[in-house]
């Protein structure tokens, strides 16, 4: 029997320095393009190889970005959020929410050679 899947939610402040092609990640979401049902928040869809975010190492695909330089990202159109990132300056402070998947409940022992392992 599988355990229940829960999420551990943490927040972190990440400071990035803009590179030649931006901050090194893509975003989805917004009031006009909900990425998560009933949530118009802005999410990281891709971390670009060798970009500023990848080199920093803390931002992850699937993270929710709560604010940029202290400016809340709630209830923004997708393009308005994009424009905030484009115009955020050289040194950018991001408040992000990580969701770490954790498994609760009974987890059966898997023997060696178990095909599900």
């Amino acid at each position: 029997m599988n355990g229940r899947v829960d999420y551990l939610v943490t927040e972190e402040e990440i400071n990035l320095t803009r590179g030649p092609s931006g901050l090194g990640f893509n975003i989805v979401g917004g009031t006009d393009q909900q990425y998560v049902s009933n949530d118009s928040g802005i999410y990281v869809s891709r971390i670009k190889e060798n970009g500023a975010a990848a080199l920093d190492g803390r931002l992850q695909e699937g993270d929710k970005i709560l604010s940029v330089n202290g400016q809340d990202l709630k209830n923004l159109l997708h393009q308005d959020a994009v424009d905030l990132f484009r115009n955020a300056g050289y040194a950018v402070s991001l408040r992000v929410q990580h969701r770490l998947q954790v498994q609760n409940g009974p987890i059966g022992h898997r023997g060696e050679g178990d095909p599900s392992g």
């Epitope: 092609s21 901050l23 893509n26 869809s45 994009v82 990132f85």
Partner: nanobody, 125 residues
Framework: HVQLVESGGGLVQPGGSLRLSCAAS????????IGWFRQAPGKEREGVSC???????YYADSVKGRFTISRDNVKNTLYLQMNSLKPEDTALYYC????????????????????WGQGTQVTVS
């Protein structure tokens, strides 16, 4: 240094085909939402077709069923296969990328993209 260079345009008869290419340098193409845009003389620039970093695609109604966008990640090149060309497809065609948006529809509708090519002329006559 990010650079996009288009090629493949030309003069073609109505009903004919062309394949446009957009070679990227200075960045990895499949990390970006990127697309094809066109501007005819005296008209506003319009998004023709765009593709997200994860491969979702968007086509303007005027080209659906005739144009196909694709990406070769090995060659780091974006393509636009254009079939059944019409005189109204005559325009200067550009490729452009967004550094942030990964929503292909938003990219194609945006007038605020981050990297642009110089364009290649397509004339259908």
């Amino acid at each position: 240094h990010v650079q996009l260079v288009e090629s493949g345009g030309g003069l073609v008869q109505p009903g004919g085909s062309l394949r446009l290419s957009c070679a990227a340098s200075g960045f990895t193409l499949d990390d970006y939402a990127i697309g094809w845009f066109r501007q005819a003389p005296g008209k506003e620039r319009e998004g023709v077709s765009c593709i997200s970093s994860h491969g979702s695609t968007y086509y303007a109604d005027s080209v659906k069923g005739r144009f196909t966008i694709s990406r070769d990640n090995v060659k780091n090149t974006l393509y636009l296969q254009m079939n059944s060309l019409k005189p109204e497809d005559t325009a200067l065609y550009y490729c452009a990328a967004s550094y942030y948006s990964d929503y292909e529809v938003a990219v194609c509708r945006s007038d605020a993209l981050d990297a642009w090519g110089q364009g290649t002329q397509v004339t259908v006559s």
